[in-house]
Interface confidence: low
């Protein structure tokens, strides 16, 4: 058992090192290690196959250190990694794509906080049994097509607080089993209308915060599960485009957010939900 | 020293207002999800409202929804929670608590709340 | 109301093992990790496990946690005076998308 950290066999094989100050992966990890715990250290680096005598691993934390590289092979080996921990490391800002490929029976990926400013293509290729990703809180400015296509199990997205601009049509393909998708406080400015086509499964839509002025329903027509909806925080303007949202939101029977106008400035503070068909005037 | 400090609590009549605060010092206050978790008299401790570290999301036990505003201020660092038209079962010992998560969402695991104040009586009678 | 079933009190003499179970359903212990809260009298409480039988830094190893199902567990073995003070569990509650706690067991050093 590595210096810094304590090993022991019961419930599950675990070595664990967490706020020892560690700058590097220990050495010496046992072999049938079935959970790591490394979080909170100064650990800036994973070299190729860090743990990959590990076969047995089925959680490995990493988070809260200051990993600015990761190998892409980092994690070769990890064939029941069931999940990964990596967030809190602000100066990550990338990951090479191929870092988790081999990863088939991953349920849960951290991410968040992460520094992250892109989404290289085929980053969560083959990752078929991930059920929760957390993207929250990096720096993404874009949802490249088919990103998530591969993630037929997902059912929690987490994209919330990154500046994210438009939601393209191809953006969430795939995610057949999706549950929750927090959008929320990003910069979207537009929503294509197809791009919601796979989510018959939504439960959870939050899309507050913010930069819509309009959502075509057409969006919002896949969504035959969709029971919470929050819009609010958004430049909404009500004019005679706001109609077929309006009307969906007069049928929507699940629980909705307010939808405050900002346009015109005699609607500006109301509700559009609680307003008339023929206040919607003007275009 | 990481600490935290609550301060607000008083007696207030059925149906009045109230609003805590909850100075945090010693640690990056924006990184951590607060919550706020109470303890009646001789009663055992309820999990009150929670808030992520950027204040985007919030969450509350049903018996406080929509009475209850959990809310922070990143730039003074303190959690605050705006407590409307109170009721005797709300009289406790209000603890605020830090904890090192994402939110609540987190499926798999929640690392508790590790950094706890002392607390901040709060009495609800006429 | 709590969610999460615990025994009202436990007792031991100095170095026994004592043990207190935590009761709760699918959507709770089912699903999430358990954390275990120590609270000494007229003081706040202290986080003493967390993801069901890690020790924050500072909690003596006498203390253990396990979780199995809906239920999990908390063992003091070597019971010291100084561990007299009621004890909580806690998980989150995916039905209630919220924490719960246990009722608490106050744990007596005889």
């Known amino acids: 058992c590595p210096g810094a950290c304590v090993c022991y066999n019961e419930p599950k094989v675990t070595t664990s090192c967490p706020q020892q100050g560690l700058q590097a992966v220990p050495v010496g990890i046992p072999a049938a290690s079935q959970r790591i715990f490394l979080h909170g250290n100064r650990i800036s680096h994973v070299p190729a196959a860090s743990f990959r005598a590990c076969r047995n691993l089925t959680i490995l934390w990493l988070h809260s250190n200051v990993l600015a590289r990761i190998d892409a092979a980092a994690f070769t080996g990890l064939a029941l990694l069931e999940q990964l921990d990596l967030s809190d490391n602000a100066q990550l800002r990338s990951v090479d794509p191929a870092t988790f490929h081999g990863l088939g029976r991953l349920h849960t990926l951290h991410l968040d906080r992460c520094g992250l400013q892109e989404l290289g293509p085929g980053l969560f290729r083959g990752l078929a049994a991930l059920q929760y990703l957390y993207l929250q809180d990096n720096a993404l400015q874009a949802l490249p097509d088919d990103t998530f296509r591969d993630l037929g199990n997902l059912t929690h997205l987490f994209l919330h607080g990154n500046r994210i601009s438009s939601v393209p049509e191809r953006a969430f393909r795939g995610l057949h089993s999706l549950d929750r998708l927090l959008l929320h406080q990003n910069r979207v400015a537009h929503v294509h209308p197809h791009a919601f086509r796979d989510l018959g499964r939504l439960m959870t839509l939050y899309l507050f915060a913010n930069n819509l002025s309009a959502l075509p329903t057409e969006a919002l027509a896949p969504l035959r599960a969709l029971q919470y909806l929050r819009l609010n925080d958004n430049p909404w303007v009500c004019d005679c485009r706001a109609r077929p949202l309006w009307a969906w939101l007069q049928k929507f029977r699940g629980s909705s957010s307010e939808v405050p106008c900002s346009l015109p400035q005699r609607l500006a503070g109301r509700d559009l939900k609680r307003l008339a068909a023929n206040d919607l005037q003007g275009c | 020293e990481v600490q935290l400090l609550e301060s607000g609590g008083g007696l207030v009549q059925p149906g009045g207002s109230l609003r805590l605060s909850c100075a945090a010092s010693g640690f990056t206050f924006s990184s951590y999800a607060m919550s706020w978790v109470r303890q009646a008299p001789g009663k055992g401790l309820e999990w009150v409202s929670a808030?992520?570290?950027?204040?985007?999301?919030?969450y509350y036990a049903d018996s406080v929804k929509g009475r209850f505003t959990i809310s922070r201020d990143n730039s003074k660092n303190t959690l605050y929670l705006q407590m409307n038209s109170l009721r005797a079962e709300d009289t406790a010992v209000y603890y605020c608590a830090r904890a090192p998560h994402y939110d609540l969402w987190s499926k798999y695991y929640f690392r508790g709340m590790d950094v706890w104040g002392r607390g901040t009586m709060v009495t609800v009678s006429s | 109301q709590p969610v999460l079933t615990q025994p009202p009190s436990a007792s031991g003499t100095p170095g026994q093992r004592v043990t207190i179970s935590c009761s709760g359903s699918?959507?709770?212990?089912?699903?999430?990790?358990v954390n275990w809260y120590q609270q000494l009298p007229g003081t706040a409480p202290k986080l003493l496990l967390y993801?069901?039988?890690q020790r924050p830094s500072g909690v003596p190893d006498r203390f253990s946690g396990s979780k199995s199902g809906t239920s999990a567990s908390l063992a003091i073995s070597g019971l010291q005076s100084e561990d007299e003070a009621d004890y909580y569990c806690s998980a989150r509650d995916d039905s209630l998308n919220g924490y719960v706690f246990g009722t608490g067991t106050k744990v007596t050093v005889l």
């Open positions: 699918s959507s709770n212990i089912g699903r999430n990790t």
């Open positions: 993801n069901n039988d």
């Open positions: 808030i992520s570290g950027s204040g985007g999301s919030t």
